[in-house]
Interface confidence: low
Amino acid sequence: LRILPEVKVEGELGGSVTIKCPLPEMHVRIYLCREMAGSGTCGTVVSTTNFIKAEYKGRVTLKQYPRKNLFLVEVTQLTESDSGVYACGAGMNTDRGKTQKVTLNVHSEYEPSWEEQPMPETPKWFHLPYLFQMPAYASSSKFVTRVTTPAQRGKVPPVHHSSPTTQITHRPRVSRASSVAGDKPRTFLPSTTASKISALEGLLKPQTPSYNHHTRLHRQRALDYGSQSGREGQG
């Protein structure tokens, strides 16, 4: 019996989380599934066979980055009912291909118990095309991340970018969390130089990257896929 790496992700109502999952191989179906209470099966939430579970349509995104051997699943407009146990995986059989367990906890306010975690303050995710920060702490097997509320508490320094047509003092609009088992501590603030780097290098390399308009790894995107092709059941 294989013991899966486990990740814990925290999100707030109305906010969003980004789950990082290992990508074991290319050209295979990858997915995020949700453990069904009672049945023990894992029902597909989103997969690369163009399936999205009905209650996640318009607010879930899957992007894969083969050169970094990972894929990202972003869930936006979080509700309390999104709390639960999920799993990343690869392969045509959802139940058998799981690679990482993900526990998502969605709540309206952060309980004091979270302040007791022996971890440095976790940087925030900002809903901005050019400004990314990665979580500052992770362990090899379990990970807990904390995010700020959609109505951000605390001040954000003004940042000037060369691309936006209006100069603005950036304030976060959507809270974000990102996690993967075994991720290393790192924080990024990109410069304004428009160099040609890949989105993943900008996200993952331990350096301060530069961004052009290709590197917008996380923008909140919600589309109504009126005609999804294919159906996926539980397993």
């Epitope: 163009n50 999205i52 995104t61 095309p129 995107r221």
Partner: antibody, heavy 125, light 107 residues
Framework: GGAAVESGGGLVQPGGSLRLSCAAS????????MGWVRQAPGKGPEWVAA????????YYTGSVKGRFSISRDNSKSTMFLQMDSLSAGDTALYYC??????????????????WGQGTLVTVSS | EIVLTQSPATLSLSPGERATLSCRAS??????LAWYRQRPGQAPRLLIY???YRAAGIPARISGSGSGTDFTLTISSLEPEDFAVYYC?????????FGGGTKVEIR
């Protein structure tokens, strides 16, 4: 950067078929979703189809569903559009387009940051 | 599908003047709107994405604004290369749709 060169256009009779190709360069092809946009003479652009970086996900506008098929060969950095049951309404300049990144799921389409120069498809008897 | 209506259909201006182009969506596209410029015999070129962000290599005299259903492309001082047709495009809903275009011509 990035460049795309389309080929395969030409004159075809109504009901006929054509296969368009797009040879891309200057970027990591498999990392980016690609698409086709067409433009009839004197009209604005019309999005036709898109395909994810792996080729596992495809998307079509309503008027071409069931007639057109988009595919890609990442080993050759090439994308294709197989067009069947062509009609006069399909007459247009067909552009190969590149999206800024790969995409799947519900929040995943984009603008087009690079376009080829187009290949002309004329459907006429 | 979302219909994008551009106005005016034609804008007659002189070099150095300010151009203001409008794009109105039949329903909200939030900030997910792009602008392209197309010169005769050329493919469209991305100018602005997500309503306000300039694409690589686009000069500061070109700017975008708006959200929801009403968007504006502004060229603060027209240069010779700006006389072309401009299209808006939304990516908020499938199918992706373009506006009918605004032609900016030399007066």
């Amino acid at each position: 950067g990035g460049a795309a060169v389309e080929s395969g256009g030409g004159l075809v009779q109504p009901g006929g078929s054509l296969r368009l190709s797009c040879a891309a360069s200057g970027f990591t092809f498999s990392d980016c979703a690609m698409g086709w946009v067409r433009q009839a003479p004197g009209k604005g652009p019309e999005w036709v189809a898109a395909i994810s970086g792996s080729g596992l996900s495809t998307y079509y506008t309503g008027s071409v569903k069931g007639r057109f098929s988009i595919s890609r060969d990442n080993s050759k950095s090439t994308m294709f559009l197989q067009m069947d049951s062509l009609s006069a309404g399909d007459t247009a300049l067909y552009y190969c387009t590149k999206a800024p990144w790969d995409y799947y799921g519900s929040g995943n389409t984009d603008h087009f940051d690079h376009w080829g120069q187009g290949t002309l498809v004329t459907v006429s008897s | 599908e979302i219909v994008l209506t551009q106005s005016p259909a034609t804008l007659s201006l002189s070099p150095g003047e300010r151009a203001t182009l409008s794009c109105r969506a039949s329903q909200s596209v939030r900030s997910y709107l792009a602008w392209y410029r197309q010169r005769p015999g050329q493919a469209p070129r991305l100018l602005i994405y997500d309503a306000t962000y300039r694409a690589a290599g686009i000069p500061a005299r070109i700017s975008g604004s708006g959200s929801g259903t009403d968007f504006t492309l502004t060229i603060s001082s027209l240069e010779p290369e700006d006389f072309a047709v401009y299209y808006c495009q939304q990516r908020n809903n499938w199918p992706l749709t373009f506006g009918g275009g605004t032609k900016v011509e030399i007066r």
